[in-house]
């Protein structure tokens, strides 16, 4: 019988060593010889590699060697199986060498803390000697605490011209020993090197590094007191794994520091009921090594007028990020607080917030927000201890096509006219900002027509129809990602009008 057709061809270029292709040989009943046929040099050259091993496992791979390997290059690889009964060829496969290059691992030679810089260790390595000069390398650094079994990973790239083969691993636990390993790959390649040998390093010890503090002001209650939800989080750049034992909070009316109230909590938020006047709130976090610096926030009086300076704000998606930009009339304002939460009909439980300094834009990675969800985004200007009037917009991190089309009705059917009306798609089904509606209509057995209108229009009059003719109509709602049709409706124009 003819040999089985070679399947699952896979090739790896072990950089500056060999290009090895392997395949599944199928069930062999008699001795089968394999020949790998290659075109290379962008199709300008071709050659063969023939297996000569007697064991079937070794016969299912073949290697090409320098100098007949160049990178970049495109290859075609085809495997021919031959036995006494004849020859059978595999499918032709296509390979870009840059995509299948595999290098040796880098060598870590030092892992050390940097004096005076907390929660960080610096990893220094030597990149593989055999790595393409013309390609940047990407790296995965994996790390874990000595007594942990689960690795965390961080990916980064190094420019090929970058002499500095170091990486600063931040956001670590203080005073903890870490195990580090590194691997690399040609930027375009799907094949990573093996992991380097592991190396150990330790971070410096420290107290908590600080807090960011924010508030949500709620309407005053009947007794004149006002609920204020205090929110806090570790200061930006604090260790990811920083341990905090608890928080001390104290607050007092701006007019009388003698009326200071103090409380402790282990939670990440706190509801205070304050009087109508302005208050100062301060807090620290603490652990066994000490206290963090004090974070302070002013709560304005109920009747206090907040300043307004944001004139215009817009959101757009660029390079996997949601970007919010605004314009301010106040040049002295250079700190802003951004709040964002999903626009759901219930009370927002997942309020997120973040401050921005020295910029009038804010970006967030798309993957930090739920795709197809509408978010309410508010920007508060902050000047010294004053918080200004927020400017709010709605935005989607990623738009999809609506999950349903508009609910459509036909009204005022005439001889040659009809009014098509439709309802807005429910918020939860829009999956994006509706930018327009398209009305598709077609006479039975006739040519189709369409008309696009902007998203503020919820009805449209069709004219110049044929009398006494059946039509089918459908309305499509579109976001930037595409459109979804509503159900199609049939109607028939009148044969004559009362005015005729």
């Amino acid at each position: 019988a003819l040999p089985a057709k070679p399947e699952n061809i896979s090739c790896v270029y072990y950089y500056r060593k060999n290009l090895t292709c392997t395949w599944s040989p199928g069930k062999e009943t008699s001795y089968t010889q394999y020949t790998v046929k290659r075109t290379y040099a962008f199709g300008e050259k071709h050659d063969n590699c023939t297996t000569n091993s007697s064991t079937s496992e070794n016969r299912a791979s073949c290697s090409f060697f320098l100098p007949r390997i160049t990178i970049p290059d495109n290859y075609t690889i085809e495997v021919e199986a031959e036995n006494g009964d004849g020859v059978i060829k595999s499918h032709m496969t296509y390979w870009r060498l840059e995509n299948i290059a595999k290098t040796e691992p880098p060598k870590i030679f030092r892992v050390k803390p940097v004096l005076g810089i907390k929660r960080m260790i610096q990893i220094e390595w030597i990149k593989p000697e055999l790595a393409p000069v013309s390609s940047d390398l990407k790296y995965t650094l994996r790390f874990r605490t000595v007594n942990s079994t689960s690795w965390m990973e961080v990916n980064f790239a190094k420019n090929r011209k970058d002499k500095n083969q170091t990486y600063n691993l931040t956001g670590l636990q203080p005073f903890t020993e870490y195990v580090i390993a590194l691997r690399c790959a040609v930027k375009e390649s799907k094949f990573w090197s093996d992991w380097s040998q592991e190396k150990m390093g330790m971070t410096e010890e420290e107290a908590p590094c600080g807090l960011e503090l924010w508030r949500v002001l709620k309407p005053a209650e009947a007794d004149g007191r006002r609920p204020v939800r205090l929110l806090w989080k570790k200061a930006r750049g604090a260790p990811v794994l920083e341990k905090t034992l608890g928080y001390n909070i104290w607050y007092y009316p701006e007019s009388n520091t003698n009326l200071t109230e103090t409380m402790n909590t282990t939670n990440q938020q706190l509801e205070l009921h304050l009087g109508g006047e302005s208050f100062w709130v301060s807090m620290i976090s603490y652990n066994s090594l000490g206290k963090s610096p004090v974070a302070t926030l002013r709560i304005p009086a109920i009747q206090e007028k907040s300043f307004q300076c944001i004139e215009v704000m817009q959101a757009c998606v660029a390079e996997d990020q949601l970007v919010v930009k605004w314009q301010s009339s106040a040049l002295d304002v250079n700190t802003w607080m951004i709040e964002w939460f999903p626009d759901v009909d219930s009370e927002p439980t997942t309020l997120s917030w973040e401050s921005v300094s020295q910029a009038t834009n804010w970006t967030i990675q798309q993957d930090k927000l739920k795709p197809f969800w509408c978010y309410n985004i508010s920007v508060y200007p902050m000047l010294h201890d004053k918080v200004g009037e927020p400017y709010s917009i709605q935005a989607y991190a990623k738009e999809g096509v609506p999950s349903e089309g508009p609910e459509t009705k036909v009204e005022n059917i005439g001889v040659k006219t009809v009014t098509i009306t439709w309802k807005e798609i429910p918020k939860s089904e829009r999956k994006g900002i509706i930018c327009n509606y398209t009305i598709f209509y077609q006479a039975e057995g006739g040519k189709g027509f369409s008309k696009t209108v902007n998203s503020s229009i919820l009805q449209y009059g069709l004219e110049s129809l044929k009398r006494k003719t059946s039509y089918i109509v459908q309305v499509m709602a579109s976001t930037s990602a595409g459109g979804t049709n509503g159900t199609s409706i049939n109607f028939k124009t009148l044969s004559f009008s009362v005015f005729e």
Partner: antibody, heavy 121, light 107 residues
Framework: QVQLVQSGAEVKKPGASVKVSCKAS????????MNWVRQAPGQGLEWMGL????????DYNPQFQGRVTITADESTSTAYMELSSLRSEDTAVYYC??????????????WGQGTLVTVSS | DIQMTQSPSSLSASVGDRVTITCQAS??????VAWYQQKPGKAPKLLIY???TEAQGVPSRFSGSGSGTDFTLTISSLQPEDFATYYC?????????FGGGTKVEIK
């Protein structure tokens, strides 16, 4: 930095053999092809052959009719070229030359300083 | 074997001149041509490969062109240090062959 250092000048009688060495440093020896090229006095360049130190694979110029043997010793990062049955027209400077560009096979990027072999009775 | 025919075998030029050296292959070698510069008593130095790619550290006044069988090395503005012998070489496959060389002399 990449360096190729060749052995010193040789004087040989016709019919004898000569073995020229080329010690490589500053790079991974097994990762690059080593070529041998010669140049007779006042003449042009003539490629003799190459070796892939990774697998010992060789490729020779047929014009040398089996007189040339190229070898490599990975442990010392040294390539050797041996030419036998020497005749007076083999008097030349012999160069080892390493390839260097991923996208340029059979190009000679780094050269040794050359070894003068004189064949004279 | 592929023959490489280089011309002229020598030329005289002045500093600042534009110099062109040509090389013809006996068969189609696509873009697999390299150019070398050799000064007396020294090893050759790679200038250009793949017909037009400059080797690392080569001044931009050196450029290569051509494909198929006809190739050119151009020195846009000859400098005093450029007086030397230039060789073309095909790097299509083995055996490698060189052109006979072009000696660039001071006029």
């Amino acid at each position: 930095q990449v360096q190729l250092v060749q052995s010193g000048a040789e004087v040989k009688k016709p019919g004898a053999s000569v073995k020229v060495s080329c010690k490589a440093s500053g790079y991974t020896f097994t990762g690059y092809i080593m070529n041998w090229v010669r140049q007779a006095p006042g003449q042009g360049l003539e490629w003799m052959g190459l070796i892939n130190p990774y697998n010992g694979g060789t490729d020779y110029n047929p014009q040398f009719q089996g007189r040339v043997t190229i070898t490599a010793d990975e442990s010392t990062s040294t390539a050797y070229m041996e030419l036998s049955s020497l005749r007076s027209e083999d008097t030349a400077v012999y160069y080892c030359a390493r390839d260097g560009y991923d996208d340029g096979p059979y190009t000679l990027e780094t050269w040794g300083q050359g070894t003068l072999v004189t064949v004279s009775s | 074997d592929i023959q490489m025919t280089q011309s002229p075998s020598s030329l005289s030029a002045s500093v600042g001149d534009r110099v062109t050296i040509t090389c013809q292959a006996s068969e189609d070698i696509y873009s697999f041509v390299a150019w070398y510069q050799q000064k007396p008593g020294k090893a050759p130095k790679l200038l250009i490969y793949n017909a037009q790619t400059e080797a690392q550290g080569v001044p931009s006044r050196f450029s290569g062109s051509g494909s198929g069988t006809d190739f050119t090395l151009t020195i846009s503005s000859l400098q005093p240090e450029d007086f030397a012998t230039y060789y073309c070489q095909h790097h299509y496959d083995s055996p490698l062959t060189f052109g006979g060389g072009t000696k660039v002399e001071i006029k």
